[in-house]
């Protein structure tokens, strides 16, 4: 039975040209995490693997930095970065947990972080 909860940074906004940290936390389970995938729509951005460490997809190498922790930092944001991002936690023995973050990249300087929310 999957008892865990993913807490994410929720709906967030950031300025064009700036950077943003995407963060997910898995809690309420003693399942052990073996890998975390970060995806944008159907594109793989990065993987943090227990054995191999971080791997950033080649097409995102210049604009994506690993961390902090299991999070992901997006840099040099463009309006095209607006959209859904997913953290996918591969765990044993529970299986897969997925968290969703919606990022809006704004042209203006009015960019505020949304509240955190939880996905069971």
């Amino acid at each position: 039975m999957m008892t865990g909860t993913i807490e994410t940074t929720g709906n967030i906004s950031a300025e064009k040209g700036g950077s943003i940290i995407l963060q997910c936390h898995l809690s309420s389970t003693t399942a052990q995490v073996t890998q975390v995938n970060w995806e944008q729509q159907d594109q793989l951005l990065a993987i943090c693997n227990a054995d191999l460490g971080w791997h950033i997809s080649p097409s995102f190498k210049d604009r994506v930095a690993p961390g902090p922790g299991l999070g992901l930092t997006l840099q040099s944001l463009t309006v095209n970065d607006t959209g859904e991002y997913f953290c996918i936690y591969h765990t044993y023995p529970d299986g897969t947990y997925t968290g969703r973050i919606f990022l809006e990249v704004l042209e203006s300087s009015v960019a505020e972080h949304g509240a955190r929310f939880q996905i069971p």
Partner: antibody
């Protein structure tokens, strides 16, 4: 150079409390999970508490659950273990130990601090 | 909880000897998803903190001499010291990090013959 320095050990009566500290240096403390591991006199090693890098997850074995609380202050590069309702069987050297994210072995250990529970 | 059983509990050996320590777990430490065995080996000298030697059952930690090697899979694991050196006399522990609570073997004390 990675350094973990424990403090706060001492003699305490059964039922008493003690707070251990671990000062970390030489690495990005907030990027690592941390644990406390203890060793009773002449005995083996026992893991007693775990905290994730950001402090949002904590785990304990049944032997200490409800009595021990692990916490951390990433701004101060410090790890803590609050021990309440202490028993004679909690007498041990307590080590803080570092863990790489997604890896749950202990890659660096402090030198330990001794806790003695006795009347 | 996963029980870790080490044998022997102690052994006497001479410098240059090949030493083998075994560790058995009460359930498999192999994750099928990544084919990794979640087992580590540590060395502890008197009055000192444990030191990581081996992780993933067979990967030597950086700076650990090549005479130390780990092998095994599933429930049966071995730590081998190919040619015992004076500084190797210590207590050795295996640890499973497959499932909570993480548990250690009882230790193997390697003494001078």
């Amino acid at each position: 150079e990675v350094q973990l320095v424990e403090s706060g050990g001492g003699l305490v009566q059964p039922g008493g409390s003690l707070r251990l500290s671990c000062a970390a240096s030489g690495f990005a403390f907030s990027d690592y999970d941390m644990s406390w591991v203890r060793q009773a006199p002449g005995k083996g090693l026992e893991w007693v508490a775990y905290i994730s890098d950001g402090g949002y997850n904590t785990y304990y074995p049944d032997t200490v659950k409800g009595r021990f609380t692990i916490s951390r202050d990433n701004a101060k590069n410090s790890l803590y273990l609050q021990m309440n309702s202490l028993r004679a069987e909690d007498t041990a050297v307590y080590y803080c130990a570092r863990q790489i994210l997604l890896r749950y072995y202990f890659d660096y250990w402090g030198q330990g601090t001794t806790v003695t529970v006795s009347s | 909880d996963i029980q870790m059983t080490q044998s022997p509990s102690s052994l006497s050996a001479s410098v240059g000897d090949r030493v083998t320590i075994t560790c058995k777990s009460s359930q498999s430490l192999l994750y099928s998803s990544n084919q990794k065995n979640y087992l580590a080996w540590y060395q502890q000298k008197p009055g000192k903190a444990p030191k990581l030697l081996i992780y993933w059952a067979s990967t030597r930690e950086s700076g650990v001499p090549s005479r130390f090697s780990g092998s095994g899979s599933g429930t049966d694991f071995t730590l081998t010291i190919s040619s015992l050196q004076p500084e190797d006399f210590a207590v050795y522990y295996c640890q499973q990090y497959h499932s909570y609570p993480w548990t250690f073997g009882g230790g193997t004390k390697v003494e001078i013959k």
